[in-house]
């Protein structure tokens, strides 16, 4: 599941602040790309990396889920 995959990625990041960056990245935002969202982060490159990684993975998983839904339909 999406939640499980994000938790796996977040587990790589030891610092609680950086973990939160990952979870923030995984949140849904259909208006902007992951890159555009990450550009706003003022907590530095470690946070941006975690945010981006989790955002990209979450976006891909969501896209796969909706693609499967369309195939079933």
């Amino acid at each position: 599941t999406l939640q499980k995959k994000i938790e796996e990625i977040a587990a790589k990041y030891k610092h609680s602040v950086v973990k939160k960056c990952c979870y923030d990245g995984a949140c849904v935002n259909n208006d902007e790309t992951c890159e555009q969202r990450a550009a706003r982060i003022s907590l530095g490159p470690r946070c941006i990396k975690a945010f981006t990684e989790c955002c990209v993975v979450a976006s891909q998983l969501r896209a796969n889920i909706s693609h499967k839904d369309m195939q079933l339909g």
Partner: antibody, heavy 115, light 108 residues
Framework: EVRLQQSGPELVKPGASVRISCKAS?????????MNWVKQSHGKSLEWIGY????????HYNQRFKGKATLTVDKSSSTAYMELRSLTSEDSAVYYC???????WGQGTLVTVSA | EIVLTQSPAIMSASPGEKVTMTCRAS???????LHWYQQKSGASPKLWIY???NLASGVPARFSGSGSGTSYSLTISSVEAEDAATYYC?????????FGGGTKLEIK
């Protein structure tokens, strides 16, 4: 220590183009850092032009500067560039690069457009 | 785009005085994405306060920031001569990123 070193002042004619450089040192340029560009007209406030993400080359522009500014990077020299084209007197300003995203600023490049 | 209006445009204070400047947004801004910069004459801007209330490295503790939604402020508890500068707020809550018009702080 992070440092952003910008190119020197430019005096250019109306209608011409100019390319400003911003050389980064003190951090891995190709890491998760964005490079933003900001315009400051004389005695005025700051205006965001756009950013480039050196890692991927991805850009995002303020709509107001689309067609005016083009942002590029040369990863091998850790340098970001901004080209400004079809210059008019309205483009006379100090231009800054800023990274981290805005924790580090270059010293600014003065561009003067005059016949 | 989100318009940031700073007030007052110019303010004057004596050393030791407490000063507050405000930044109002035309629509709601996330507190994580509201920052303040200090710019002295002829110099580049410096990140001064990030995410509404966090002081950037090297910023004296007499500075503080607060606010939420559409109203934010920067306060100096006891102004010193070296604080003379223009202070800009900036939002990164939505694109395009925008700056306020600035508040110029003069010391008597």
């Amino acid at each position: 220590e992070v440092r952003l070193q910008q190119s020197g002042p430019e005096l250019v004619k109306p209608g011409a183009s100019v390319r400003i450089s911003c050389k980064a040192s003190g951090y891995t340029f190709n890491d998760y850092y964005y490079m933003n560009w900001v315009k400051q007209s004389h005695g005025k406030s700051l205006e965001w032009i756009g950013y480039i993400f050196p890692k991927t080359g991805g850009t995002h522009y303020n709509q107001r500067f689309k067609g005016k500014a083009t942002l590029t990077v040369d990863k091998s020299s850790s340098t970001a560039y901004m080209e400004l084209r079809s210059l008019t007197s309205e483009d006379s300003a100090v231009y800054y690069c800023a990274s981290g995203p805005f924790a580090y600023w270059g010293q600014g490049t003065l561009v003067t457009v005059s016949a | 785009e989100i318009v940031l209006t700073q007030s007052p445009a110019i303010m004057s204070a004596s050393p030791g005085e407490k000063v507050t400047m405000t930044c109002r947004a035309s629509s709601s801004v996330s507190s994580s994405y509201l920052h303040w910069y200090q710019q002295k004459s002829g110099a580049s801007p410096k990140l001064w306060i990030y995410s509404t209330s966090n002081l950037a490295s090297g910023v004296p503790a007499r500075f503080s920031g607060s606010g939420s939604g559409t109203s934010y402020s920067l306060t100096i508890s006891s102004v010193e001569a070296e604080d003379a500068a223009t202070y800009y707020c900036q939002q990164y809550s939505g694109y395009p990123l925008t700056f306020g018009g600035g508040t110029k702080l003069e010391i008597k």
